[in-house]
Amino acid sequence: MAVTACQGLGFVVSLIGIAGIIAATCMDQWSTQDLYNNPVTAVFNYQGLWRSCVRESSGFTECRGYFTLLGLPAMLQAVRALMIVGIVLGAIGLLVSIFALKCIRIGSMEDSAKANMTLTSGIMFIVSGLCAIAGVSVFANMLVTNFWMSTANMYTGMGGMVQTVQTRYTFGAALFVGWVAGGLTLIGGVMMCIACRGLAPEETNYKAVSYHASGHSVAYKPGGFKASTGFGSNTKNKKIYDGGARTEDEVQSYPSKHDYV
C-alpha cells in the first residue's frame, strides 16, 4: 500500500512539476525591468526565452519574437535547449510512469517490468528536473552578471550633457516557477525511484525440504513469494494538471481603432 502511495504521489508531483516546467518555458517573464532605483518610466519591459514584450502605461502590450537563431546569445540558446530537453524527458517519463503505475493493470505485465519502468521514469524525472533547474539557474546567473554590468554604466553620458538610461533587468516570475517546478519534478523522480525498490520482487529461495509421512510421500517445495498486483480502492482517474491560471496586471488596456496585438 505504501509503495502504491509513494508511486502515485511521485507521479502526481512529477506531473505538476512538468506542467510547471512547460509553463515556465512558455512564459514571457523570465526577466523583468528593474524598477528599483530607476527613473520612473511609463514603459515596462520584460523578456522570455522566445520573445520580448513591452507594456505601456496605456495598457498596450507589444511582443516581438526572436526571429533569429544565429543572432541570439549562446547562453539563451543553451537555456532553451535545457528546458526543451527537460520537457521532452519529463513527457516521456510521464508516459512510461502511467504504464508503470501499480494501480493500472495492462495485460499480464510482470511486477519486475513495472519496477523497471518505475525506475526508468524516476530517473527521467530526476534528469528533467535537473535540466530545468540548470536552465533557470544559467539564465539567472546571466541576469545577475548583466545587472551589475548595466549598473556600472547605468547613466552613460553622451557628450556629458545628454543621459541615456540603460534598462536593467531582474528576475522574472518564470524563474521562480522554473525553480519550483524543477524541484517538484526532481522530488517526484526520487519518489518513483524509492517506489521502484518496493515494487521489485523479493526472491527468497529456500532449499527443498522432504517431509516423510507414513503411507505416502509428499514433498513441499516453497518457492519465491510474489507480491500480488491487486487494484487499489481508488480507481478514479484524477486529472492533476494545473493549468496555471495567470492573472493579468491591473493595467489600462487600449481598445483603439487600430488594435493589432
Epitope: 525591468q33 520612473v40 511609463a42 514603459v43 496605456s58 541615456t164 493595467v251 489600462q252 488596456s253 487600449y254
Partner: antibody, heavy 118, light 113 residues
Framework: QIQLVQSGSELKKPGASVKVSCKAS????????MNWVRQAPGQGLEWMGW????????TYADGFTGRFVFSSDTSARTAYLQISSLKAEDTAVYFC???????????WGQGTLVTVSS | DIVMTQSPDSLAVTTGERATINCKSS????????????LTWYQQKPGQPPKLLIY???TRESGVPDRFSGSGSGTDFTLTISSLQAEDVAVYYC?????????FGQGTKLEIK
Amino acid sequence: QIQLVQSGSELKKPGASVKVSCKASGYTFTNYGMNWVRQAPGQGLEWMGWINTYTGESTYADGFTGRFVFSSDTSARTAYLQISSLKAEDTAVYFCATLGYGNSLAYWGQGTLVTVSS
Amino acid sequence: DIVMTQSPDSLAVTTGERATINCKSSQSLLNSGNQRNYLTWYQQKPGQPPKLLIYWASTRESGVPDRFSGSGSGTDFTLTISSLQAEDVAVYYCQNNYFYPFTFGQGTKLEIK
C-alpha cells in the same frame, strides 16, 4: 465614436474649491487611462498627471500634488479633477485626455476654463 | 524631470513650402525593449484642444494628412510638414511619453509668410 465632454466654465474666489468633470462615451471607460493637462492663458501645455480608471491609482506631476486630486466614477463613466485652496495662478483651461498608443494623449475634451479672481 | 526644448519658437513659411520643427529631450526617449521612441507631436489651433498628430516619434495617427511626418531617435526629433497648407497654421507641441512626468515642449508657433 470616442468623445470626452467636460463641464462648463467656472469662476471662483481664491481659497475656494472646484471640481471639473469629464464624461466619456463611445468606449469602455475603464479601458482608458485619463490624463489631465493645464493650459494657462497664452501659455503652453502642462501635463498634470493621470488616473488609471480601472484601478483608481493616480500619478501626479511635480507641482500638482496636494491641492489637486483625480478621481473617477465608473458607473457614471466620468473622471474628475478637484482643485482645493484655489489661487490666482490656477486660472487656466483644464483638459482631460485619454491615453493611447505610445502613451500619447489620443482623445481630448473641449477644455474647461477655471477663473480664480477676487 | 525631462526637459523638452523646441526650436524655433515661431516659424513663418510660404504656402506649399516645407516646414520643419525640432524637438530635443534632455534624456533619450528610446526604449531598448521595442526600439521605439516615446515622443509625440500635437497640433493646437486657437480655441481648440490639442490634436494628436504623431506618436512613437514617426507613426502618424489615423486621419492625419500624409504631409505630416515625424523622424528622429534618442534625443533629437523633427516634425516635417512637406507642403504647408493654410489650415496648418497652429502651435505645435512635442511631448515626452517615456518618463514621468510627461513633459511638453514650450511649443512652436507656425504661421504663413
